[in-house]
């Protein structure tokens, strides 16, 4: 049967993003409509047809355009994605003979981790804090020269859609740690990044 091929995309916040749909059919459509999927009913964003060209709905006027003007292959581009743009989008190819044939492409927005790593001595112990803020939520691990060191982790969700993960390494005998390297590892979207800290006696 006739189908539409799509691909989900993940793009960085405040960068452009494109979603593409391809109608796997011998014939082009009469009109292509892009809609954003919403809880109640989909919202029309833009249409393209030979008769009327590109028609962008007012709410999307400065946000998107159709960058591949095709009736078999259609691409929409968001100029500068925000968190509100995350979600799934439907492309509807209204074809002669077979009606509306739809595909769904989903857009995920990510924010690269911002990491801070610092330490603090007190009389009898040392706290090393590693904090990573990103979207989706990052994971924080420690690589230390010896085992048996405790850590505690706190996760905080922010209104802007990012999540901060803060892990504190509690070292009971700080003298042994002086001059040694501690590594905070941040895992985000399948990539691990090392942040190194050498402890010096203040």
């Amino acid at each position: 049967q006739v189908q539409v091929v799509t691909q989900d995309e993940r793009e960085q916040l405040y960068t452009p993003a494109s979603l593409k749909c391809s109608l796997q059919n011998a014939q082009e459509a009469l009109i292509v409509t892009w809609q954003k999927k919403k809880a109640v009913s989909p919202e029309n964003m833009v249409t393209f047809s030979e008769n009327h060209g590109v028609v962008i709905q007012p709410a999307y006027k400065d946000k998107i355009n159709i960058t591949q003007l095709g009736l078999q292959n259609s691409t929409i581009t968001f100029w500068n994605i925000t968190l509100e743009d995350e979600g799934c989008y439907m492309c509807l190819f209204n074809t002669f003979g077979f009606g509306k044939i739809s595909g769904t492409a989903c857009l995920t927005v990510y924010v690269q981790p911002i990491v801070s790593l610092h330490y603090k001595f007190s009389e009898d112990h040392l706290n090393i804090t590693c904090s990573a803020t990103a979207r989706p939520a990052p994971m924080v691990f420690w690589k230390v020269p010896r085992s048996g060191i405790e850590n505690s982790t706190v996760t905080l969700s922010h209104p802007n859609g990012t999540t901060s993960v803060t892990s504190i390494l509690h070292i009971k005998d700080p003298k042994n740690q002086v001059g040694k390297e501690v590594i905070c590892q941040v895992l985000h979207l399948g990539t691990v990044t090392d942040f190194k800290q050498t402890v010096n006696k203040g």
């Epitope: 049967q1 006739v2 014939q27 009469l30 002669f96």
Partner: antibody
């Protein structure tokens, strides 16, 4: 040159089936939809259904309640329309045509099907 | 199903006359309408598609207009070969449906 050549006239008894062929030549068969319309004596044209030869996807007028089947043989560049459980009201001229989207340009010469006991 | 109603059902006109045939859909069909000419014992011939686009090879005296529910086929200057029955076809919604036809006779 482009041609759609239909099979010859048929006389059928009520309850029988008829299969009309439409042989295409002069173009790439899978690039155009093949449609079937019919016209009973003194009546308006009636859309029966169509097929996209590229995939073999077809769409039928539900008025025919599953009595119509449209198929194709790409190797022979031929489309077929089969109508079963024939009744006297099915006496008509059956036409095949081709379209690129909604652009209809060539038609077969028509096939008269007579249903009579 | 969408009903297509043509008017008039028949008309007689003279060579050189301007002839107008109308087609009314029972619901909005956007611009998804074609016009056909059919002569006795012959297959239909496409004249206009998407309400106002002329099919290649069709004389420019034929034109189509309208959108939504009301459509018109106009022959600006009738020629002797224009006799026959004219049908409109909607293809906005399946099943696609034809009008009942307008029989045009030359006076």
């Amino acid at each position: 040159q482009v041609q759609l050549v239909q099979s010859g006239a048929e006389v059928k008894k009520p309850g029988a089936s008829v299969k009309v062929s439409c042989k295409a030549s002069g173009y790439s068969f899978t690039d155009y939809i093949i449609l079937w319309v019919r016209q009973a004596p003194g009546q308006r044209l009636e859309w029966m259904g169509h097929i996209d030869p590229y995939y073999g996807s077809s769409n039928y007028n539900l008025k025919f309640k599953g009595r119509v089947t449209i198929t194709r043989d790409t190797s022979a560049s031929t489309a077929y329309m089969e109508l079963s459980s024939l009744r006297s009201e099915d006496t008509a001229v059956y036409y095949c045509g081709r379209s690129k989207r909604d652009y209809f340009d060539y038609w077969g010469q028509g096939t008269l099907v007579t249903v009579s006991s | 199903d969408i009903q297509m109603t043509q008017s008039p059902s028949s008309l007689s006109a003279s060579v050189g006359d301007r002839v107008t045939i109308t087609c009314k859909a029972s619901q909005d069909i956007n611009s998804y309408l074609s016009w056909f000419q059919q002569k006795p014992g012959k297959a239909p011939k496409s004249l206009i598609y998407r309400a106002n686009r002329l099919v290649d090879g069709v004389p420019s005296r034929f034109s189509g207009s309208g959108s939504g529910t009301d459509f018109t086929l106009t022959i600006s200057s009738l020629q002797p070969e224009d006799f026959g029955t004219y049908y409109c076809l909607q293809y906005d919604e399946f099943p696609y449906t034809f009008g009942q036809g307008t029989k045009l006779e030359i006076k």
